[in-house]
Amino acid sequence: TIPPHVQKSVNNDMIVTDNNGAVKFPQLCKFCDVRFSTCDNQKSCMSNCSITSICEKPQEVCVAVWRKNDENITLETVCHDPKLPYHDFILEDAASPKCIMKEKKKPGETFFMCSCSSDECNDNIIFSEEYNTSNPDLLLVIFQ
């Protein structure tokens, strides 16, 4: 719990507490912004990002964005608040412990994005269908 000597601030989005006053530790995420990538046609890739950052706000989660156009492939790794859109998309999978890439419609490029909420989870980005929970067989396994 937060001790009395730690002053409360009126508008404090740097600290998140639950009903019991427990403090939410911030996420640790890979945070290299946009870098060129060699990740292509693979079931999963490592980010090759050497920077693990403490997310600024405790509610932020890890995000990875993979983009391919006629010229290059890039991988973006950041922290982001799931209440806010990123690249105009909602982070619908923010509670996932793994970063499962989902394709998004973007004109002129192939665009995949994932979000997740375990430490450094955007270091390993997963494209493989076997992790996709829209697969009925996998759902059957999960709920058995």
């Epitope: 639950d18 427990a22 530790f25 996420q27 412990p97 375990s118 430490d119």
Partner: nanobody, 124 residues
Framework: EVQLLESGGGLVQPGGSLRLSCAAS???????RMWWVRQAPGKGLEWVS?????????YYANSVRGRFTISRDNSKNTLYLQMNSLRAEDTAVYYC?????????????????WGQGTLVTVSS
């Protein structure tokens, strides 16, 4: 009961350096990820840096990366924060805290014990 006691704060000019210490007693220090957290006047808590108990892997907020260095001496149950190239915006009360063990992705651990904090003022 665990007790954390910070020291090393003070008044320093912009560009100067300080080294904070946090002495832990009454606990198995080596079991915990340790944090430095700061609170500027009228602002919220900012998570500055963290260090793992084994292997001593370190993490930093983007605002302090390259200027601050966290370290720990498990034999002395002490956590350190070396702060270089200090700026006015680094002015804050600095707390150390320990992160209780648990599942890595749970993310809702308690900051179960805090130090009383040490004030760092960066001003010319």
């Amino acid at each position: 009961e665990v007790q954390l006691l910070e020291s090393g704060g003070g008044l320093v000019q912009p560009g100067g350096s300080l080294r904070l210490s946090c002495a832990a007693s009454g606990s198995t220090f080596t079991e915990y990820r340790m944090w430095w957290v700061r609170q500027a006047p009228g602002k919220g808590l900012e998570w500055v840096s963290a260090i793992e108990p084994i292997g001593h892997r370190t993490y930093y907020a983007n605002s302090v990366r390259g200027r601050f260095t966290i370290s720990r001496d498990n034999s002395k149950n002490t956590l350190y924060l070396q702060m270089n190239s200090l700026r006015a915006e680094d002015t804050a009360v600095y707390y150390c805290a320990k992160q209780a063990p648990g599942e890595k992705w749970a993310r809702r651990w308690d900051l179960d014990y805090w130090g009383q904090g040490t004030l760092v003022t960066v001003s010319s």
